[in-house]
Every structure is written in structure tokens, then in C-alpha cells.
């Protein structure tokens, strides 16, 4: 058993049929010695009396908020949560496996630049009785500070018969140098509680590996005289690290017909313009990627040919 | 259709082209190592990230873009002095910091070159003959060093009398390649920045 927050305790249980469970001794936080009674979850049933209460925690029915009272007055609370371990593996019932980029990916994180700011998100099908807390650091043995905000519900989607809820959090490394070469990864730890079930999830990454630039901005077409060709131009996204001559991007320009089956023409360039042939009803799209370190491509920025 | 990116014209800042080749070569070598050594801990997640140049050179600090020198977090500057002549500086008014930067890059390359050559000698003794260093990568390191053209004492190649542990050598190769790729990215950014200045 360990303390998660003030008066909130996590009981770690091996979860299998007829498991013996864990014996827990609760102590009432009071100088009083006599006339103390214990209840669970605002029930009127008295579980025991005295300054301490010993319970055998085996299942969720044994968890909850234990309260000690004296003469109708509440003295203190202890909330017991359960953390299940099945076949030596901690349960991951609360969050959905996103399976990208690999199986058992519960947390996904992205950064728009090298400023040390990043966003992580996760998915669940649970709509209520849910709370999260996020902590992060650079490295684990001698951790350096990363500050995370509160996790918020960022999207709701319908997937077949199920509703899916996306939560996200923004974090910022306290003293980040965009030009630094990372040798210690960022660690992100998410605590999740659903009803009386506790779980924790972790992710470890280098900012350089989670970079995904915003799409290029101000995408424009300039027809070339007496030609089917157009000059496409664009700019670096505002959110990208500066100076751009140091944090350079490379671009992919794509001409796509109306039908997905039509042949795509693609050109790769380090410049912020390109000359392409504009077909009728086609659209031109441009996306960006760090020129020197191949992390994710940005989403496409698009304009119609007409 | 995938159209390759055009190579920079020869009139450009002389080291940019070499640094781009360096990054390409080290990235290819790392990819090859990851594939060949698939049953070894050779991915970014599995290895310890070590920097053999730590406390010996200060490339990131010395080569910091002017715009980032206002960023407190970028300024854990370590006092290091380097010799200041080099052909990449040719026909350019350069500050002392730029000379320091380029000589720091030169020292990095020299250290990695020694490490890679020592390692290759060990790998050539491996009866499995599983992996060797790409000669192209070693040649590209050499070319960039020549383009930088700094006078510096040659570092003798490390030799070891004891029987090499090939497993450890291959893991060290992965560690070295990961670190060198990160440094090659920094070098490429620096060259691009200097070229634009």
C-alpha cells in the first residue's frame, strides 16, 4: 500500500480467483482514543470501532472511502483504490491501446517545434467517474523539470456503437534550449482513476522524435504565362523554431486529381516554392518535415488548381 | 513520382555539401546497423545515449545561432579554446565564435573518426563477419575534415591487446552511430545557418 495523495491510498493486488488479498490497517487521524466508529462510503453500517481498523482487501467491494467518526462528527477519511496485477502485468483497462506506432501505445505525444513544449493525448471509452493527473521530467534518475497542465477532455468521437473520449495535456520543459542535443529522454507519467480503480501509464521519448511541424502557411498559386504550369509558393508555419536557416524544413509538393485513384505527382524540395503542372479539378498540397531529422511529416496544406 | 532533391551548387559555402553527405552516410549506416543487428539492443529506445565528445568539445554552444544566444537555457557555455584557421572560413569575415564553432566541429569529427577506425579494426576480427563500417561514411568524415582544414595533432588509433568482446563492440557501434547521427544533424544545421548568413 502507498499514498497517492493526502488521504488517498493505492492497494496493489494480485488479481486471480481466490487470491488472499492484502491486509490493510487504517488509523484514524485524531488525538481521540475512545468512542471512534468506522463506516465505508457513507453507509450507516458500522464496520468497527477503535482508533484503528484492520481490513482484508480482496476486491473492489472492499475499496472506497473509509471514514472514522465520533458522536456524529467526522474525524478523518481514507480512500482506498485498487491497482490490479494480472499474471504479473498491471491492468490497463482505463485507456485504449492506440496501436500506433506500436502495440501497447496508450499515450501519444507530439511537438510542433524544439521549444520544449509538447502535447500528449490518450483515448478512453469511459465517460464518467474518471480523473487524471500528469507528471513529467527530463530523465528519471536525476530528473529535470517539466511542467504539465491539467488533462482536459479535448474531443468526443463516435466509433460504431461506442463513444470514444480523447483527453490531452500540454507540457513545457522548464529550461529548454531548442538547439540542444538530447541525451536523456522526456518521461511522461499519467495516473488514472476510474471509480476505485487506479492505473498508471508512462511514455518515454526525445522531443526530436515526436516533432510534427504545423502545415506550411500562405500556400499560393501563380500561373505562368502561356503554360499549364503554376508556381506554388508557401511559408514556414509560425509555430516552427527559428532561425529557419538553422531549423530548416524540407517540403513535399503533391498534385492530386479529384479521384483518389488518379496518379499523384510528387516533388520534394528544400525551397519554399516549386513549379508544377496544374490539372483541371486537381488540387495542390504541400507538407513539411524537419530537413535533417526525419520525424513526422506535417498535415497537408491544400489549394484547388482552378 | 519521387523526384530527388537537387544537390547544392558548387559556389555555396564549401562545407554545406560535405555536411549533407555526412548526415546521409551516417543515417544509412545507422539504418544498416539496426537491420543487421536486429537481435541486439540497437534502437534509440534500447541504447544508452552517450556523447564521446562531452567535456572535450562544445559544438552546440560554440555554434549557437545568434538568435538563440538570448536564451538562458542555451548558455551553459564551457570555456574551450581552439585553433582558428580553416578553408571553410575562406573569403568571409568571420567572428571568433564562428572559428571556434568550426574548429569544435573538426575536433568532433576527429574523435569519431578515431573511434570508428578502432571499432572497425575489431569488427574485422569477428569470425561472424556480421557488420563493418561503411567505407563511404569514413571517407565522408575525412572529406569534411579536409574541407574544414584545421591544424591539429593527429590522434593515434587506439589499439588493444586483449581479445575483443564482439557483442560489446557491436552495442558500442550502435551507441556511437546514434550519437554521431545527432551530432551530424547539428553540424548540418550549423552549416546551413552559416551558409545563409
Amino acid at each position: 500500500i502507498w499514498e497517492l495523495k493526502k488521504d488517498v491510498y493505492v492497494v496493489e493486488l494480485d488479481w486471480y480467483p481466490d487470491a488472499p488479498g492484502e491486509m490493510v490497517v487504517l488509523t484514524c487521524d485524531t488525538p481521540e482514543e475512545d468512542g471512534i466508529t468506522w463506516t465505508l462510503d457513507q453507509s450507516s453500517e458500522v464496520l468497527g470501532s477503535g482508533k484503528t481498523l484492520t481490513i482484508q482487501v480482496k476486491e473492489f467491494g472492499d475499496a472506497g472511502q473509509y471514514t472514522c467518526h465520533k458522536g456524529g462528527e467526522v474525524l478523518s477519511h481514507s480512500l482506498l483504490l485498487l491497482h490490479k496485477k494480472e499474471d504479473g502485468i498491471w491492468s490497463t483497462d482505463i485507456l485504449k491501446d492506440q496501436k500506433e506506432p506500436k502495440n501497447k501505445t496508450f499515450l501519444r505525444c507530439e511537438a510542433k517545434n524544439y521549444s520544449g513544449r509538447f502535447t500528449c493525448w490518450w483515448l478512453t471509452t469511459i465517460s464518467t467517474d474518471l480523473t487524471f493527473s500528469v507528471k513529467s521530467s527530463r530523465g528519471s534518475s536525476d530528473p529535470q523539470g517539466v511542467t504539465c497542465g491539467a488533462a482536459t477532455l479535448s474531443a468526443e468521437r463516435v466509433r460504431g456503437d461506442n463513444k470514444e473520449y480523447e483527453y490531452s495535456v500540454e507540457c513545457q520543459e522548464d529550461s529548454a534550449c531548442p538547439a540542444a542535443e538530447e541525451s536523456l529522454p522526456i518521461e511522461v507519467m499519467v495516473d488514472a482513476v476510474h471509480k476505485l480503480k487506479y492505473e498508471n501509464y508512462t511514455s518515454s521519448f526525445f522531443i526530436r522524435d515526436i516533432i510534427k511541424p504545423d502545415p506550411p502557411k500562405n500556400l499560393q498559386l501563380k500561373p505562368l504565362k502561356n503554360s499549364r504550369q503554376v508556381e506554388v509558393s508557401w511559408e514556414y508555419p509560425d509555430t516552427w523554431s527559428t532561425p529557419h536557416s538553422y531549423f530548416s524544413l524540407t517540403f513535399c509538393v503533391q498534385v492530386q486529381g479529384k479521384s483518389k485513384r488518379e496518379k499523384k505527382d510528387r516533388v520534394f524540395t528544400d525551397k519554399t516554392s516549386a513549379t508544377v503542372i496544374c490539372r483541371k479539378n486537381a488540387s495542390i498540397s504541400v507538407r513539411a518535415q524537419d530537413r535533417y531529422y526525419s520525424s513526422s511529416w506535417s498535415e497537408w496544406a491544400s489549394v484547388p488548381c482552378s | 513520382r519521387n523526384l530527388p532533391v537537387a544537390t547544392p551548387d558548387p559556389g555555396m559555402f564549401p562545407c554545406l555539401h560535405h555536411s549533407q553527405n555526412l548526415l546521409r552516410a551516417v543515417s544509412n549506416m545507422l539504418q544498416k546497423a539496426r537491420q543487421t543487428l536486429e537481435f541486439y539492443p540497437c534502437t534509440s529506445e534500447e541504447i544508452d545515449h552517450e556523447d564521446i565528445t562531452k567535456d572535450k568539445t562544445s559544438t552546440v554552444e560554440a555554434c549557437l545561432p545568434l538568435e538563440l544566444t538570448k536564451n538562458e537555457s542555451c548558455l551553459n557555455s564551457r570555456e574551450t579554446s581552439f585553433i582558428t584557421n580553416g578553408s571553410c572560413l575562406a573569403s568571409r569575415k568571420t567572428s571568433f565564435m564562428m572559428a571556434l564553432c568550426l574548429s569544435s566541429i573538426y575536433e568532433d569529427l576527429k574523435m569519431y573518426q578515431v573511434e570508428f577506425k578502432t571499432m572497425n579494426a575489431k569488427l574485422l576480427m569477428d569470425p561472424k563477419r556480421q557488420i563493418f563500417l561503411d567505407q563511404n561514411m569514413l571517407a565522408v568524415i575525412d572529406e569534411l575534415m579536409q574541407a574544414l582544414n584545421f591544424n591539429s595533432e593527429t590522434v593515434p588509433q587506439k589499439s588493444s591487446l586483449e581479445e575483443p568482446d564482439f557483442y560489446k563492440t557491436k552495442i558500442k557501434l550502435c551507441i556511437l552511430l546514434h550519437a554521431f547521427r545527432i551530432r551530424a544533424v547539428t553540424i548540418d544545421r550549423v552549416m546551413s545557418y552559416l551558409n545563409a548568413s
Partner: nanobody, 120 residues
């Protein structure tokens, strides 16, 4: 901040029925238990019924068999169905919620109350 708003109170004749509702809004986090309390003039506040996170109800002896507590998780609403009401049930009925938010810790919230009067 969690807000609790009760409704459904009123004047009813002995033997009659009422259904109280309590809607929870705001960042409720993980709710560990919800309960109905009542306070009659000049008397101490007493627990009427409670329901835990697993949906297990619990009743004070005097209301067993007459009152039913339930919770609609999706709507974050607590109900109290009161049948066979007697004048002794006259009181202000208050909704209570206990929960956990991992950013702030354990909390307890009370509603303003809704008046139930049983009289002929």
C-alpha cells in the same frame, strides 16, 4: 468547482410519493459515493440513503422499503424515490457527493437542499 442542484421537493399528503433529483456539474472526477441527507427544524442532519461507486445502496433504518436511491452515471444525476411518506419525513433534503480529483485531491460537495413537507 462541483455544483449540486436538487429539485423535486414540495408539499405532499401522508402516504404520497415524491421523486427528488440532484444534478452534479463541473469537474466531478471520480465519484466515490453520493448520498441524501435530511435536516428537520431543530434537529441534527441525518443520513437518509447513500450509493457507492459500484452502485450499492444503503438506507437508514426508518426509510428501508419505502425509499429507493439510484444514480444515472451518464447524466451525473442522483435520485431519491420516496413512497409512503409520513409527517416524520418532513425536512430539507440535501444532496451530498464525495469524490476524488487527482489534481486537487479528495473533496465533498453539498447542494442547497429542497424542502419536503408531508402534511394533510
Amino acid at each position: 468547482e462541483v455544483q449540486l442542484v436538487e429539485s423535486g421537493g414540495g408539499l405532499v399528503q401522508p402516504g404520497g410519493s415524491l421523486r427528488l433529483s440532484c444534478v452534479a456539474s463541473g469537474s466531478t472526477g471520480s465519484i466515490t459515493s453520493m448520498a441524501w441527507y435530511r435536516q428537520a427544524p431543530g434537529k441534527q442532519r441525518e443520513l437518509v440513503a447513500s450509493i457507492n461507486s459500484g452502485g450499492r445502496p444503503n438506507y437508514q433504518e426508518s426509510v428501508k422499503g419505502r425509499f429507493t436511491i439510484s444514480r444515472d452515471n451518464a447524466e451525473n444525476t442522483l435520485y431519491l424515490q420516496m413512497n409512503s411518506l409520513s409527517p416524520e419525513d418532513t425536512a430539507v433534503y440535501l444532496c451530498n457527493l464525495r469524490g476524488l480529483r487527482l489534481d486537487t485531491g479528495l473533496y465533498e460537495s453539498w447542494g442547497q437542499g429542497t424542502q419536503v413537507t408531508v402534511s394533510s
